[in-house]
């Protein structure tokens, strides 16, 4: 059936907190005002409507909910809690809705939620318990399989006096709730580093997107536990070289494809191991496109075409011979 739109102001209140319950039970197939609903597709779209809250009268059949392009600002605890619960909701897209605050337990009472997209929201305040729902050391497992967090970094002047990377990682690791996560996208977040413990605690990952960040090094990151990892996107970062430990770990992952385009590779003596590895490995996609950025004399040289004689380091002069 084609999407239907309802402008009904039927008063069904099934709000985000236990203290506010339905005034009267919502009709099972009712479509909220300003939304489009297709019961056949189990889909509700409330898109670009400047909503400041999640609609209260969502139909019980909803499996795919699009709330993109709104002005939600804050997701409180139980923002999607309803009586009866939205038991079928599997995919929730909140991208581009001006969210800057996601509180503990915001996605509680969504037992089937497998895909969550919070991309393009300036998340200055992401609770450590946003996805786990509780501050217990071990929480009930989250049903989430895909978590899309691309471009959630707030503008510099809105960031709190803490590490943005740390805030995001705390939410990913809290209560070990995301052990079943298979896809994690963290592109375009100005990440300078990847905290060393994050990947070890997400053992089910198949797809990890860290593209378009500012990662300089993977020295302290371990991929060893990610035995199911199929794709690793590291394009458009600030990587200078991959060292032996990282190369060996990547080579040891049975299903992996790695994407390394558009990094400022430094083609000096420290690059020799990586060049040797690139020539032998099948895991790097588009490896023939990787080029040197530094030093100047090596700029735009293709990594695969380099040999050990090309990769030299300027000798470090002893202090007594250095000039100011």
């Amino acid at each position: 059936s084609s999407p239907t739109s309802s402008a009904s102001s039927f008063s069904s209140s099934a709000p985000f907190l236990a203290s506010a319950v339905s005034a009267q039970p919502p009709l099972p197939d009712q479509c909220p005002a300003l939304c489009e609903c297709s019961e056949a597709a189990r889909t509700v779209k409330c898109v670009n409507r400047n909503l400041t809250e999640v609609p209260t009268d969502l139909p019980a059949y909803v499996r795919n909910l699009f709330l993109t392009g709104n002005q939600l600002a804050v997701l409180p605890a139980g923002a999607f809690a309803r009586r009866p619960p939205l038991a079928e909701l599997a995919a929730l897209n909140l991208s581009g809705s001006r969210l800057d605050e996601v509180r503990a337990g915001a996605f509680e009472h969504l037992p089937s939620l497998r895909q969550l997209d919070l991309s393009h929201n300036p998340l200055a305040d992401l609770s450590p318990f946003a996805f786990s729902g509780s501050n217990a050391s071990v929480s009930a497992p989250s049903p989430l399989v895909e978590l899309i967090l691309n471009h959630i970094v707030p503008p510099e002047d809105e960031r709190q006096n803490r590490s943005f990377e740390g805030m995001v990682v705390a939410a990913l690791l809290a209560g070990r709730a995301l052990q079943g996560l298979r896809r994690l996208e963290l592109a375009s977040n100005h990440f300078l580093y990847l905290p060393r413990d994050v990947l070890a605690q997400l053992p089910s990952l198949r797809h990890l997107d860290l593209s378009n960040n500012s990662l300089v090094s993977l020295t302290y990151v371990s991929f060893r536990n990610l035995t199911h990892l199929e794709s690793l996107h590291l394009e458009d970062n600030a990587l200078k070289v991959l060292h032996n430990g990282t190369l060996a770990e990547l080579q040891g992952l049975p299903h992996i494809r790695v994407f390394l385009d558009n990094n400022p590779w430094v083609c000096d003596c420290h690059m020799a191991d990586m060049v040797t590895w690139l020539k032998e490995t099948e895991v790097v996609q588009g490896k023939d496109r990787l080029t040197c950025a530094y030093p100047e004399k090596m700029r735009n040289r293709v990594l695969l075409e380099l040999n050990s004689a090309d990769l030299d380091c300027d000798p470090i002069l002893p202090p007594s011979l250095q000039t100011s």
Epitope: A7, S8, S9, S11, S12, S13, P15, F16, L17, S19, A20, A23, P32, A33, L34, C35, C46, R49, N50, L51, T52, E53, V54, P55, T56, D57, Q71, A73, V74, P76, A77, D100, E101, R103, A124, D125, Q160
Partner: antibody, heavy 120, light 111 residues
Framework: EVQLVESGGGLVQPGGSLRLSCAAS????????MHWVRQAPGKGLEWVSY????????YYADTVKGRFTISRDNAKNSLYLQMNSLRDEDTAVYYC?????????????WGQGTTVTVSS | DIVLTQTPLSLSVTPGQPASISCRAS??????????LHWYLQKPGQPPQLLIK???NLESGVPDRFSGSGSGTDFTLKISRVEAEDVGVYYC?????????FGQGTKLEIK
């Protein structure tokens, strides 16, 4: 000038019904969420209900849940509160108030109020 | 529900003197993004009017002798020099969650 004018109050017996109205002018009504807030005689302020700008969200205080229904007609710049099964403790001045959002908002404009008296 | 407790419940102030009202919340009503606490004045026989939004932001048209401060659970409304027109009942209100609640009110009188 922002104006909110409540009407529909009066004397009603316990168990009876009333419908309050709030007429808005001086601003784009459809861009704002609206609240009802009440004040019992000699008492403080009590939030009653909220409706979002496009009637997608409705919230109620526990004390009125299941008895009161909030609604709005953006074409008529009007807010309503249908009050059923009225009780003595519902006696109060009822104010309508404007907000830009529920949690990130505040009551930035108020009507003069309409008095509801529930008594046998 | 979040309980807001105001102190004192009444105060009598000489014109030109300062006044201070406290509002304490039963749980934090601040995040790092926003403070969900607002102040109102209800003058005798009138509806309430917004004075301070988000703890410290003066509403347009409100005299700058009014100021607000605080975060978390403890908030303060200050009047630097009380004037006769400031009499009435002052309320704090949170918007952290449903239900929205008000403090019980503080009655300001002029000596």
């Amino acid at each position: 000038e922002v104006q909110l004018v409540e009407s529909g109050g009066g004397l009603v017996q316990p168990g009876g019904s009333l419908r309050l109205s709030c007429a808005a002018s001086g601003f784009t009504f459809s861009n704002f969420g609206m609240h009802w807030v009440r004040q019992a005689p000699g008492k403080g302020l009590e939030w009653v209900s909220y409706i979002s700008s496009g009637s997608t969200s409705f919230y109620y205080a526990d004390t009125v849940k299941g008895r009161f229904t909030i609604s709005r007609d953006n074409a008529k710049n009007s807010l309503y509160l249908q009050m059923n099964s009225l009780r003595d403790e519902d006696t109060a001045v009822y104010y309508c108030s404007r907000t830009n959002s529920l949690l990130r908002g505040f009551f930035d404009a108020w009507g003069q109020g309409t008095t509801v008296t529930v008594s046998s | 529900d979040i309980v807001l407790t105001q102190t004192p419940l009444s105060l009598s102030v000489t014109p030109g003197q300062p006044a201070s009202i406290s509002c304490r919340a039963s749980q934090s009503v601040s995040s790092s993004s926003y403070t969900y606490l607002h102040w109102y004045l209800q003058k005798p026989g009138q509806p309430p009017q917004l004075l301070i939004k988000s703890a410290s932001n003066l509403e347009s048209g409100v005299p700058d002798r009014f100021s607000g401060s605080g975060s978390g659970t403890d908030f303060t409304l200050k009047i630097s020099r009380v004037e006769a027109e400031d009499v009435g009942v002052y309320y704090c209100q949170h918007s952290w969650e449903i239900p929205l609640t008000f403090g019980q009110g503080t009655k300001l009188e002029i000596k």
